[in-house]
């Protein structure tokens, strides 16, 4: 029961996490520029991985996509790649984990197969979460190291004078969404891996001694229904009948006088 709960909770946590990673990737507020005041209107500038937006105090908002790939910073491309890899891995992990859920019966799927699928999805969730955390952290590092900060400069040339005002970008909401979502996906993955250990069938190697009445030459050997990983002598989970009772460790030996009561 605890295994099912752990697996189910891991799935739900990962599902929320991946939904968060998708949301963060699509969000425009990865970085926000400090409020830019001017004599006309307050302008709020913010950027995402795919487009840049400007909002005026009047409420007017304009967003434009990055239609070029060549002019984009390599770091931005790397962040995009990490987030997409995280989403893809997470989506595959979700698909695998659905079939791995203990509460869902699909044909005659054995527990060992479900355990393997649970472990696979768990690893996928962990990698997915790490990708998201890495992507968000790389972007945050760009902001911290003043990648977005323009240096105050003024020069004259063709077309006049440009004054690049000291404006600074700060962390946008998407970064926090990404960190939390990545963390949740990571936790969900760990839970799935823990659940996998409980799902994996273990060999219960008891010394099974069978008894039968002296008037009969057939002995019932208990232990036929024990959990097996295929390493024991009774891999087919059948009732074993033979001429005398034997322990599991004495399958090859002949009956002796000690076998009978």
């Amino acid at each position: 029961m605890a295994v099912t709960a752990c697996q189910g909770l891991g799935f739900v946590v990962s599902l929320i996490g991946i939904a968060g990673i998708i949301a963060a990737t699509c969000m425009d507020q990865w970085s926000t520029q400090d409020l830019y005041n001017n004599p006309v209107t307050a302008v709020f500038n913010y950027q995402g991985l795919w487009r840049s937006c400007v909002r005026e105090s009047s409420g007017f908002t304009e967003c434009r996509g990055y239609f070029t790939l060549l002019g984009l910073p390599a770091m931005l491309q790397a962040v995009r790649a990490l987030m997409i890899v995280g989403i893809v891995l997470g989506a595959i992990g979700l698909l695998v984990s659905i079939f791995a859920l203990k509460c869902i019966r699909i044909g005659s799927m054995e527990d060992s197969a479900k355990a393997n699928m649970t472990l696979t999805s768990g690893i996928m969730f962990i990698v997915s979460g790490l990708c998201a955390i890495a992507g968000v952290s790389v972007f945050a590092n760009m902001l911290v190291t003043n990648f977005w900060m323009s240096t105050a400069n003024m020069y004259t040339g063709m077309g006049g004078m440009v004054q690049t005002v000291q404006t600074r970008y700060t962390f946008g909401a998407a970064l926090f969404v990404g960190w939390v979502a990545g963390g949740l996906t990571l936790i969900g993955g760990v839970m799935m891996c823990i659940a996998c250990r409980g799902l994996a069938p273990e060999e219960t190697n008891y010394k099974a001694v069978s008894y039968h009445a002296s008037g009969h030459s057939v002995a019932y050997k208990p232990g036929g229904f024990k959990a097996s990983t295929g390493f024991g002598s009774n891999t087919k989970n059948k009732k074993i009948y033979d001429g005398g009772a034997r322990t599991e460790d004495e399958v090859q030996s002949y009956p002796s006088k000690h076998d009978y009561v």
């Epitope: 006309v40 500038n45 990055y66 984009l72 910073p73 977005w148 004054q163 690049t164 404006t167």
Partner: nanobody, 121 residues
Framework: QVQLVESGGGLVQPGGSLRLSCAAS????????MTWYRQALGKEREFVAG???????NYADSVKGRFTISRDNSKNTLYLQMNSLRAEDTAVYYC???????????????WGQGTLVTVSS
Amino acid sequence: QVQLVESGGGLVQPGGSLRLSCAASGSIFSIPVMTWYRQALGKEREFVAGISKGGTSNYADSVKGRFTISRDNSKNTLYLQMNSLRAEDTAVYYCNAQASSFGWMPLSDYWGQGTLVTVSS
């Protein structure tokens, strides 16, 4: 980079009219706000009028009712219609744009070289 080129300045009699233009060119990603400033000889640069892409406009008290600012977003061009000109309107008029040359770059202040408007009889 974003280049701004002003035109339309010249000599005009008091009470006359002029229309200034400012054309933005270059690697423009977005220009949220465009403004006109002026600087008279020996004085500090002062705000005249400005307009945002959303249509919000603002005027200095000294030009209200006389000057009209407009912009053509499709052409990235700013206009200033100046009526009932006075001698104190004599100055070099500068075009200013708060723009980003690339989407991931911060908004920056870009300035034109200015156009001279002389109001004299």
